[in-house]
């Protein structure tokens, strides 16, 4: 079968599938397409995974290329490392396999690059411009187990047709991911439909054992079944319910599983439990209970806004600092006379490509629940779990169209309470001055309804929110960042967008690239995103400066003595990387221990300025933070860096503040 036929094709193993989509896309478009189906761009990290990719791609034309999930920021060459400074879109640089087309050569790496796989020959890895639309892309889908393909039976009219949770339909699968459906047509005219489900005894298996095409006994009275009657192998009958219903306790009648309103927002019949819960756009299922929905903090998605982002229940908005105004795309900021521009992003505006109907802006604002976020130049997203196919997967949608998801209905958030404790909260209290706005700030908008400040008792000392004041010494006023108001009930003045700032002991040369940001910290309906920090700089956290807006009585000021602790490398076994070479067969390349970064349990992404001597490798499982690619648009002129959290007891050091990124990037992280 020609992999370059119009239809996608896939190859599955017991725990993951690769799928080839022969559709011309840019890297960002390909990344989005995989994510929309619940997967990611392919990350073949081992020779075994690479072999599966080879088998899937086959012997294609030399002129065709397929995106895989490797991307590198500008000036992030690390030629001594197996991935050469490239990072998997899942957020790490771990690999036991590489297949570069050429040996590494020195160079400044001035532009961002993405990796495509040659469709022909050895399927070598080539780097190139992320904005080029190459011929196709490879997605990877992980899941909790798989069912083996069904054996053909004598009474079958043809091979079983399988539909995967990621919408691929084929008769060719060897393994079927959990959540797949098998349709078997029998010569007698009847058919059977099976689901790959979790088994009570553990593992996964087909919802029904074979043989599937035998038996009789439904003719009298439909076998006593309310909906469908199925004749089993041993002659007895089983009752089934049509789509949207499940079998009642009596085994014969059918009931609507959504009738009892088991879901907080949206219920859809089907799936192993008989129903699946879905959340409206702007919400996501709660981790502890998939029946409930919690607000998605879109401001945690890297690059959602160029400068500042405010999250509210069910949506978010972008803002620009004083002297800048929001461009028509609702994301970018450009210098102008106007101040405090904003545009509502009701999730579907920018994150989804095709336009859905905009929610009324007034309604959207009624749902406002807090928090300004100053966006750094590049951000990393929190890890996302693969979809749980114990819940029914989304219905398929036509190629090149986004799923039409209804907008959330606005609701007022509950009164403000003590901040939610973020992951690694005990660490954060030691290592990172968390800046969280606990106000619902007045937003400069003609469309905004009155904001009623939430009143609440003073927070206990454990939950008080530090305020960091700041100055950049010896900077022209054009480069001076503003100050973020982090007072509790006080509202920022109209047309004055709040900002964050921190005093830095020095500024660093413009040619040094900024660090990749750290994982984000969640507050009460509010998040301030703080990027990662390179080692060897101590933070200077000071009391409030002259530019500080008036403080409310319960807004504490953080007074901290910064301690600089050395980062002590620990031993790490050398990573053995299998590398294919264009001139020799696959062989093992042992990377010398000297080139290995220390195996610190860190949340810092490993990219760092090229002059940093001890890059930290994200080998800790919590460090695999997915990245979101971004194309187009200039980088911010000034990146603001604050100390970051790491799961250690020691404070991390202060990052480099880079004034530059004047060069427009090839593409950027979202």
């Amino acid at each position: 079968q020609d992999p370059w036929a119009a239809e996608p094709r896939s190859a599955c193993g017991p725990s993951s599938c690769y799928a080839l989509f022969p559709r011309r896309r840019t890297f960002l478009e390909a990344w989005r397409a995989c994510r929309e189906l619940g997967g990611d761009l392919a990350t073949p990290r081992t020779p075994e995974e690479a072999q599966r990719v080879d088998n899937l791609v086959g012997a294609g034309p030399a002129s065709r290329l397929l995106w895989i999930g490797l991307q590198r920021q500008a000036r992030q060459c690390q030629l001594q490392r197996p991935l050469r400074g490239f990072t998997w879109t899942t957020g790490d640089q771990d690999t036991a396999f590489t297949n570069w087309a050429q040996p590494a050569t020195g160079g400044p790496c001035p532009a961002q690059r993405c990796v495509a796989l040659e469709a022909s020959g050895e399927h070598r890895w080539l780097e190139g411009s992320c904005t080029l639309a190459v011929d196709g892309y490879l997605c990877q889908f992980g899941f909790e187990g798989a069912c083996p393909a069904l054996q053909d039976e004598a009474g079958q009219a043809g091979p079983a047709v399988y539909t995967t949770p990621f919408h691929l339909v084929s008769t060719e699968f060897e393994w079927l991911p959990f959540g797949s459906v098998a349709a078997v047509q029998c010569q007698a005219g009847r058919g059977a439909s099976l689901l790959c489900v979790k088994q009570p005894e553990g593992g996964v298996g087909w919802s029904r054992a074979g043989p599937l095409c035998l038996g009789a006994g439904c003719s009298p009275d439909n076998g006593g079944c309310e909906h469908e009657c199925v004749e089993e192998v041993d002659g007895h009958v089983s009752c089934r319910c049509t789509e949207g219903f499940r079998l009642a306790a009596d085994g014969r009648s059918c009931e609507d599983p959504c009738a009892q309103a088991p879901c907080e927002q949206q219920c859809e019949p089907g799936g192993p439990q008989g129903y699946s819960c879905h959340c409206r756009l702007g919400f996501r299922p709660a981790e502890d209970d998939p029946h409930r929905c919690v607000d998605t903090d879109e401001c945690q998605i890297a690059g959602v806004c160029q400068q500042m982002c405010v999250n509210y229940v069910g949506g978010f908005e972008c803002y620009c600092s004083e002297g800048h105004e929001l461009e028509a795309d609702g994301i970018s900021c450009s210098p102008a006379g106007a101040m405090g521009a904003r545009a509502s992003q009701d999730l579907g505006d920018e994150l989804l490509d095709d336009g859905e109907d905009e929610e009324d802006e007034d309604e959207a604002w009624e749902a406002f629940g807090g928090g300004w976020t100053e966006m750094p130049g590049i951000l990393w997203m929190e890890p996302t779990q693969p979809p749980d196919f114990a819940l029914a997967y989304r219905p398929s949608f036509p190629e090149d169209r986004e799923p039409q998801i209804p907008y959330p209905e606005p609701t007022w958030p509950p009164p403000l309470s003590a901040p939610r404790v973020p992951y690694h909260s005990s660490v954060l209290s030691v290592t990172r001055p968390v800046v969280v706005s606990a106000t619902r700030p007045t937003l400069p908008s003609a469309h905004q309804p009155p904001v009623i400040p939430a009143t609440h008792p003073a927070l206990s000392r454990d939950h008080q929110i530090p305020v960091i004041a700041a100055n950049y010494p010896d900077l022209p006023s054009a480069y001076q960042p503003g100050i973020l108001s982090v007072s509790h009930p006080a509202q920022p003045p109209a047309h004055q967008p709040p900002m964050i700032s921190t005093r830095y002991p020095e500024l660093f040369p413009a040619h040094q690239s900024p660090m990749f940001p750290d994982t984000q910290v969640a507050g009460t309906q509010t998040t301030t995103h703080l990027p990662a920090i390179p080692p060897n700089r101590a933070p200077l956290v000071t009391t409030l400066g002259a530019h500080q807006p008036p403080q409310a009585p319960d807004a504490p000021v953080l007074r901290t003595q910064a301690t600089q602790l050395p980062i002590i490398p620990t031993a790490q076994p050398s990573l053995t990387t299998s590398s294919r070479s264009p001139v020799s067969p696959a062989h093992q390349v042992s990377v010398p221990a000297a080139t290995q970064p220390p195996a610190l349990p860190t949340l810092l992404p490993s990219q760092s300025p090229t002059n940093q001597t001890s890059p930290i490798s994200p080998t800790h499982p919590h460090s695999k933070v997915p990245q979101i690619p971004r194309e187009d648009g200039p980088s911010p002129k000034l990146a603001l860096w604050l100390p970051s959290a790491a799961p250690t007891a020691a404070p991390t050091a202060l990052g480099e503040a880079s004034l530059a990124e004047h060069i427009q990037r090839d593409d950027r992280w979202l």
Epitope: W4, W100, Q102, S120, T131, L132
Partner: antibody, heavy 124, light 108 residues
Framework: QVQLVQSGPEVKKPGASVKLSCKAS????????IHWMRQAPGQRLEWMGY????????TYNQKFKGRVTITLDTSASTAYMELNSLRSEDTAVYYC?????????????????WGQGTLVTVSS | DIQLTQSPKFMSTSVGDKVTITCRAS??????VAWYQQKPGKAPKLLIY???NRYTGVPSRFSGSGSGTEFTLTISSLQPEDFANYFC??????????FGQGTKLEIK
């Protein structure tokens, strides 16, 4: 060595058709996409369309509204470009070019080899 | 369509001079830009691909830089054989190539 050799100059009347050829040598013909461009006197180059010899996949510039057809004779390693309903403004030098696949470990869509060009004159 | 604007259109220079030609794109094209040299009656020759990568066999006096919307071709020390027409090309929305109008280098 890689070469693209184009057919000789043509003089046509308005309304007529012209079919130009581009013979490739020195490489595996089915491994590289062939593009056609043209350059009218004093004007910049203009992309017309491409063909992929691997599977005869073609894409054309909408500007030519169905007037252009690109075909192949794979056995002769030759690509053809036919332009119909000629008008005086179609007077130009027509180029075929090979799109590169990869250079030194980079993939890129620039043209690494060009034909010498064919002058087509449309005049009544 | 993405428009490419080259400047200057003409340049009179001498052997040994340093020459810089610029190419501006009407929108962000990343690094999907190539530079070509064309002599009268001859086929164009690829000099630079992906904005800054020198093509095989191209002398080191030719260099390219830029990303986004502004790109430059630099000839560090002009040689007699370098007097020719130079043009840029973008291919970010492949296959819809667009080209600059060209810069003619003449001997002063």
């Amino acid at each position: 060595q890689v070469q693209l050799v184009q057919s000789g100059p043509e003089v046509k009347k308005p309304g007529a058709s012209v079919k130009l050829s581009c013979k490739a040598s020195g490489y595996t013909f089915t491994d590289y996409v062939i593009h056609w461009m043209r350059q009218a006197p004093g004007q910049r180059l203009e992309w017309m369309g491409y063909i992929n010899p691997y599977d005869d996949d073609t894409t054309y510039n909408q500007k030519f509204k169905g007037r252009v057809t690109i075909t192949l004779d794979t056995s002769a390693s030759t690509a053809y470009m036919e332009l119909n309903s000629l008008r005086s403004e179609d007077t130009a030098v027509y180029y075929c070019a090979r799109r590169g696949n990869s250079y030194d470990g980079y993939f890129d869509y620039s043209m690494d080899y060009w034909g010498q060009g064919t002058l087509v004159t449309v005049s009544s | 369509d993405i428009q490419l604007t080259q400047s200057p259109k003409f340049m009179s220079t001498s052997v040994g001079d340093k020459v810089t030609i610029t190419c501006r794109a009407s929108q962000n094209v990343g690094t999907a830009v190539a530079w070509y040299q064309q002599k009268p009656g001859k086929a164009p020759k690829l000099l630079i691909y992906s904005a800054s990568n020198r093509y095989t066999g191209v002398p080191s006096r030719f260099s390219g830089s830029g990303s986004g919307t502004e790109f430059t071709l630099t000839i560090s020390s002009l040689q007699p054989e370098d007097f020719a027409n130079y043009f840029c090309q973008q291919y970010t929305n492949y296959p819809m190539y667009t080209f600059g109008q060209g810069t003619k280098l003449e001997i002063k």
